[in-house]
Interface confidence: medium
Amino acid sequence: AWELTILHTNDVHSRLEQTSEDSSKCVNASRCMGGVARLFTKVQQIRRAEPNVLLLDAGDQYQGTIWFTVYKGAEVAHFMNALRYDAMALGNHEFDNGVEGLIEPLLKEAKFPILSANIKAKGPLASQISGLYLPYKVLPVGDEVVGIVGYTSKETPFLSNPGTNLVFEDEITALQPEVDKLKTLNVNKIIALGHSGFEMDKLIAQKVRGVDVVVGGHSNTFLYTGNPPSKEVPAGKYPFIVTSDDGRKVPVVQAYAFGKYLGYLKIEFDERGNVISSHGNPILLNSSIPEDPSIKADINKWRIKLDNYSTQELGKTIVYLDGSSQSCRFRECNMGNLICDAMINNNLRHTDEMFWNHVSMCILNGGGIRSPIDERNNGTITWENLAAVLPFGGTFDLVQLKGSTLKKAFEHSVHRYGQSTGEFLQVGGIHVVYDLSRKPGDRVVKLDVLCTKCRVPSYDPLKMDEVYKVILPNFLANGGDGFQMIKDELLRHDSGDQDINVVSTYISKMKVIYPAVEGRIKFSTGSH
């Protein structure tokens, strides 16, 4: 028997520095977690103690904090190289700055293989990107070899900016021939490493013949055997065992997100490459694990540029950006409109001639808007200003919801109207009319939504049984501010870009902004 230790991360999302327990900015260092310096300490400790160790990343290193905004992926390559990752799969967010934003900072600089078997380049890009990412890689580990085959969510064109010269194929269809090829090369231990979410990870384990282990990402799935060490609630045991169609027991793992945990899986193979046993658990990277001093020093050196960036002008406003709670928790506010417009703009993807865009709607809890911006400071808007408006370090995510769920969400928005509560929704691509004279739960009297399958966008009545795409804060997608119906009824949830980054990019693009209050939210006392 031969034993392999798989260490794995996924969805780190630019958390190079340690964070608080909820993965936001570290405030009290004695209670902080994660970060590459602490990760390196634990990885080195395991590498010294165990013979056959692989360190793998399942994608979405890109996007999430000011580190990515400023360094644009160079930080990912630098620190992953320093940690000596063995392989990485491409995630959807690796394409956020286009293909060039992946090639130059990461693909050309990484000293480890970057993988995806279901992304095929065509046209002029094919030769430019050739060899910079691979469908699979055979890695020597001790006296043996292990095949790693990569995959990426086929939804990436809707979630990021991969351009028109990359084709995202069905994961299972693309993986099988690559695994077969590895088998012909006499590689009998094969790990599928990828970024398509837990449901697809399980399908790959079930359907792709020859895959021994699946290491996934994208869905931020936390798996744990026993009593979990922090706030995350396990979606299942670690590893999650799937019985493949050909009768094998295939372990599937994921390690939550944001570098909070290091996935730790021990696999025992027999001489024919069959998995005999698998066990392990994610390791919580809390303050009991010291930060490696050399990596920490490097982080501090790179940090300097971030502090300078925070005070630079991104663009100008020629109007007061009303982000006050007196406005945003009671009525349409122009800060809410600005943020929602930025959220939609960030999700412009012309992937189908029938649609002007794949999503037109945004909702945003008024309580998430924490500060106004005064235009009388020469109109200047800085990252620092935006960090006061959006201080929670969240993301703006893409969900799919039924019309009936949206209706419930808007009822919840005003169910206790007048108490300055945070659930009052700001909107984009939506016209809502409330009648507050009616009982809670029956106050939404009109809800029109901007069409997507149209050449000239116009507002149509919400159809209760239709499925709509909506951009919203991850806080709402997770049921925050009492929006349990969103969490319970969402049909799909894809994690998006850092909130401040979305708004800052929009302001930089527009250069001068002047958002208005324009009748997106109205109040009526209608008779019937």
């Epitope: 019309g403 009936s404 209706k407 009319v433 009648d435 009616r438 009982k439 029956d442 009297v445 009109k446 149509d460 009545p461 919400l462 159809k463 209760m464 049984d465 009526s524 209608g526 008779s527 019937h528």
Partner: antibody
């Protein structure tokens, strides 16, 4: 496929009562307002009554107000029209129709996007 | 009597463009949105236009609606024989607190 099927029509004497039913399938019934619309032989369409998704808002056309009662049972996916004190001028084909919205308010007026095939009510002595 | 009026009949030849109009008052068409319904012989009505000018999916773009003041109109371009039907406009009426239909227009394709 969304379907509305009316039943309960027939021949009835003036002054008597009749109860029409409409069975809905293929939709989440309690998400929508519902209506009764009638069409006298050789004549145009006439809105009779409407009811909001949760029965909180109900409306009637003047000629039937006080005589007809609209109701719904969301658990049974059914809409009803109780017609009392029937008159000869109530003779018509009665259609059940689904609203595009959930309310009966002017602010949420869109239109009726699914119709049944109708049930005939004849009031005659 | 009908509070929203339509001309009783209209006609056109195949390929032609025909317009059916509907006239009301400030309490209905003037202050509210208009729908149009098509009723083919012996069948139930079908929603053709809502919110003045919006077509439900499946309705050909040959049909278009517009509204100006207290009048609304339905235009049918590239008239086809299968367009022969009764056409009804409808609106909310504030004074009646309910929905009203026009008297209907019978369209004949010559």
């Amino acid at each position: 496929e969304v379907q509305l099927v009316e039943s309960g029509g027939g021949l009835v004497q003036p002054g008597r009562s009749l109860r029409l039913s409409c069975a809905a399938s293929g939709l989440t019934f309690d998400d929508y307002a519902m209506h009764w619309v009638r069409q006298a032989p050789g004549k145009g369409l006439e809105w009779v009554s409407g009811i909001s998704w949760n029965s909180n808002s109900i409306g009637y056309a003047d000629p039937v107000r006080g005589r007809f009662t609209i109701s719904r049972d969301n658990a049974k996916n059914s809409l009803y029209l109780q017609m009392n004190s029937l008159r000869a001028e109530d003779t018509a084909l009665y259609y059940c129709a689904k609203d595009m919205g959930w309310e009966l308010l002017k602010t949420s007026y869109y239109g009726m996007d699914v119709w049944g095939q109708g049930t005939t009510v004849t009031v005659s002595s | 009597q009908t509070v929203v009026t339509q001309e009783p009949s209209a006609s056109g030849t195949p390929g032609q463009r025909v317009t059916i109009s509907c006239s009301g008052s400030s309490s209905n068409i003037g202050g509210n949105t208009v729908n149009w319904y098509q009723q083919l012989p012996g069948t139930a009505p079908k929603l053709l236009i809502y919110s003045n000018n919006q077509r439900p999916s499946g309705v050909p773009d040959r049909f278009s609606g517009s509204k100006s003041g207290i009048s609304a109109s339905l235009a049918i371009s590239g008239l086809q024989s299968e367009d022969e039907a009764d056409y009804y406009c409808a609106a909310w009426d504030d004074s009646l607190n309910g929905r009203v239909f026009g008297g209907g227009t019978k369209l004949t394709v010559l």
